[in-house]
């Protein structure tokens, strides 16, 4: 059956032979209605990429550099399955390109000019493409030929396989730049030996090189890693201090109509029958005909790449930056130490309009990027399409797991002028009911619930975390009879109460009328039994403070809070009747942009923050008539974090633990991708 066939692309006679053997052996173990293999032979990996894009083939396995080519338009391919190395219990699908130095040296990443460098080889990922790509814009002009620019940047190097006649400085530390193990400084171990012997000041290798060459921890402690933020870390901390994370070997397919489920079904069956130590007659990860045919011989198996993970996320911002710099050879005109405009990520249409107004008032220091969901915004910040946004604590957690860092906190209670330097304790997550109802925390089953959005702190993580520990399952849509929790599956009972309008029904953005704090409260007013919101929501939307038709006549005393002990209290008593304390919303950014974002925002709030008194005729950053656009409307200022500059430190151990527990109930495709 053609639609059940995976057309594998082979790039040599030997690969084609192995592919035919793969096809025949799969036929013998799979049912006739299962997936099948067909083989397509092409002259090169690039031809395979084009063939898949043109629907003449379906799959091929590629190295990282080629995954980048596959992702570029017009190919638009995406990673669908990753080879893994190491054990099934601790599968490695990536390696980290690192810059290793001796501990007793005293320079940082931005001080490499004039140092001596050790490389694995010319044109190799960890040893050349990544470090030179990331340093590209610091190289002296003209940057072409690249070898000459690099020779003029470092004071001496060993770059195996470079042309020692044309670029003698690249071979200064290893005369002749031998391109094999005859050169003692060749490849990973060689580049590390070049550093160890004192020939070079820095070695560009993979994270595992140090461990493979120095079994003794005391010896490893004589070395450190250079981080991109111009700090150093121990060699064990490579996950937090690397030049780029590089995928090892990856199966790619079309982004649309790519048969990814079928490819996974095929490869999953293949590894069961013909994986490591499974079969004598055919082996997926070796071949008598040659090395690394179709798949790497060193692979131990396959893992399915999460569906939310596109090529940009898979390759990572640093890797793409490095390769793009090398390929396109373009550098920003502004010096790299000068802050470029900050691209704010706006959620849907209403936030985009406010962001546009901010952009005009900032004279272009702020630019705007849009996405339909918070997770899409986080992904855009990760891949460099946007730079920053302010997030609820639940999304600060997801952003943190995806490598972003908190930059500034929204403060709600501290008056100026101390606001900017004050660390607030957070706000209260509360459960609000109508005073006329007889509901308590203990009899919510079967009632109608209203939530700010799935994954948010007061509206979801805190109440559902508490509920989970009571009911011990994740079927919250069965616990409540119906509700509105924007971001739930469209057919879920937790979308039933949402108001839309139609195409935006239950979407986690302002197009859904019951989204956010004000939306969840409106849902309670109009349809629900309980709303999970922040403690300020009721006072902010009653007593005429919200002029919208649905809210203008509401009275504060018509609503009460549910306490965890089964009692109820006035909305004026959140300190004695709340579900938990929630961390304030915070601005997040990529590490490389954090300082610029902080500097610019502190400057912007001085002009457009809460010191502006007349918001009817001036732009106000923290105002949007109860809609909480870009920032919460009750923000007094954005405050410095001081040492709370990681998501764990910012959110606090207790909250991180609560959200981690709730992860077994997670419906976050982004979180799944970021923890792959």
């Amino acid at each position: 059956v053609p639609e059940k066939s995976v057309r594998w692309c082979a790039v040599s006679e030997h690969e084609a032979t192995k592919c035919q053997s793969f096809r025949d052996h799969m036929k013998s173990v799979l049912p006739s209605n299962g997936p099948s293999v067909a083989c397509v032979k092409k002259a090169s990996h690039l031809d395979c990429i084009r063939a898949i894009a043109a629907n003449e083939a379906d799959a091929v396995t590629l190295d990282a550099g080629l995954v980048y080519d596959a992702y570029l338009a017009p190919n638009n391919l995406k990673p669908v399955v990753a080879e893994f190395y190491g054990s099934k219990e601790d599968p490695q699908t990536f390696y980290y390109a690192v810059a290793v130095v001796k501990k007793d040296s005293d320079f940082q990443m931005n001080q490499l000019r004039g140092r001596k460098s050790c490389h694995t080889g010319l044109g190799r990922s960890a040893g050349w493409n990544i470090p030179i790509g990331l340093l590209y814009c610091d190289l002296p002009e003209p940057r072409k030929p690249l070898e000459k620019a690099v020779a003029n940047f470092f004071s001496g190097s060993c770059v195996p396989c470079a042309d020692g006649t044309d670029f003698p400085q690249l071979c200064q530390l290893c005369p002749g730049c031998g391109c094999s193990t005859l050169n003692q400084y060749f490849s990973y171990s060689g580049a590390f030996k070049c550093l160890k012997d004192g020939a070079g000041d820095v070695a560009f290798v993979k994270h595992s090189t140090i461990f493979e060459n120095l079994a003794n921890k005391a010896d490893r402690d004589q070395y450190e890693l250079l981080c991109l933020d111009n700090t150093r870390k121990s060699v064990d901390e490579y996950k937090d201090c690397h030049l780029a994370r590089v995928p090892s070997h990856t199966v790619v397919a079309r982004s649309v109509g790519g048969k990814e489920d079928l490819i996974w079904e095929l490869l999953n069956q293949a590894q069961e029958h013909f994986g490591k130590d499974k079969s004598k007659e055919f082996q997926l990860f070796s071949s008598p005909h040659g090395k690394d045919l179709l798949f790497k011989d060193s692979a131990h198996g396959f893992l399915k790449v999460p569906p939310r993970m596109d090529a940009k996320m898979y390759l990572g911002y640093e890797y793409i930056t490095a390769i793009r710099n090398l390929r396109e050879g373009t550098c920003p005109e502004a010096p790299t130490d000068e802050c470029k405009p900050v691209k704010w990520c706006a959620l849907s249409h209403h936030e985009r309009l406010k962001c546009d107004e901010w952009s005009v008032n900032s004279a272009g220091k702020i630019e705007c990027e849009s996405a339909e969901t918070t997770e899409d915004c986080i992904a855009k910040i990760m891949n460099g399409e946007a730079d920053a946004m302010s997030l609820d604590g639940g999304f600060v957690y997801i952003a943190g797991m995806c490598g972003l860092v908190p930059v500034l906190a929204e403060n709600y209670n501290t008056p100026n002028p101390n606001c900017e330097n004050t660390a607030e304790e957070g706000y209260f997550a509360v459960a609000v009911v109508k005073s006329s109802s007889d509901l308590t925390w203990d009899n919510l089953k079967g009632k109608k619930s209203c939530h700010t959005a799935v994954g948010r702190t007061a509206g979801w993580n805190i109440p559902m975390g508490l509920l989970y520990s009571k009911i011990n399952h994740c079927r919250f849509d069965e616990f409540f009879s119906e509700g509105c929790a924007p971001g739930s599956e469209k057919n879920s009972s937790l979308c039933k109460l949402c108001m839309g309008p139609s195409p935006n029904l239950c979407e986690p953005n302002n197009k859904e009328g019951y989204y956010g704090y004000t939306g969840a409260f409106r849902c309670l007013v109009e349809k629900g039994d309980v709303a999970f919101v922040k403690h300020q929501t009721v006072p902010q939307n009653t007593g005429g403070k919200n002029p919208d038709a649905w809210a203008k006549n509401l009275k504060e005393e018509d609503y009460e809070l549910l306490c965890l002990d089964g009692s109820r209290k006035s909305v004026q008593e959140p300190a004695n009747c709340h579900l938990a304390r929630a961390p304030n919303h915070a601005v997040v950014a990529r590490k490389d942009k954090a300082d610029c974002v902080q500097t610019l925002l502190l400057d912007q709030q001085r002009m457009f923050g809460s010191s502006v008194t007349d918001c009817s005729s001036n732009f106000c950053l923290f105002e949007s008539k109860t809609k909480d656009l870009l920032f919460r409307d009750d923000t007094v200022c954005l405050a410095k974090l001081h040492d709370r500059n990681t998501y764990e430190k910012y959110l606090g151990e207790e909250y991180v633990k609560a959200v981690t527990n709730l992860r077994k109930c997670s419906t976050s495709p982004l979180l799944e991708a970021c923890t792959f």
Epitope: H349, L353, K354, C615, F619, S624, K625
Partner: nanobody
């Protein structure tokens, strides 16, 4: 809500010029920021240029150096002078004010600009 009426669009050859006007009924003097947006078929509406009451302006990268936004508070009007027009400038152009703080989704009829030889 201030009512806004756009005019001045038309058909123009590449390299030509047009001047769009946006007249407000009611006072725009109290309105801080005004913006010109455009929407080409099948594309998202995008900010082309904006101006604050104090005269701070901002332009989309694609129109910098070719378009100029200005406002006449006495006449309650905002203008967009478009020079060196290109085929990719073809779109319906809308004017908006940000006065409501609701960041509404209410737009006028717009004015069609077509750049074609």
């Amino acid at each position: 809500q201030v009512q806004l009426v756009e005019s001045g669009g038309g058909l123009v050859q590449p390299g030509g010029s047009l001047r769009l006007s946006c007249a407000a009924s009611g006072s725009i003097f109290s309105i801080n920021t005004m913006g010109w947006y455009r929407q080409a078929p099948g594309k998202q509406r995008e900010l082309v240029a904006g101006i604050t009451r104090g005269g701070t302006t901002n332009y989309a990268n694609s129109v910098k150096g070719r378009f100029t936004i200005s406002r006449d508070n006495a006449k309650n009007t905002v203008y967009l002078q478009m020079n060196s027009l290109k085929p990719e400038d073809t779109a319906v152009y809308y004017c908006t004010d940000y006065s409501s703080r609701y960041y509404h989704d209410y737009w006028g009829q717009g004015t069609q600009v077509t750049v074609s030889s």
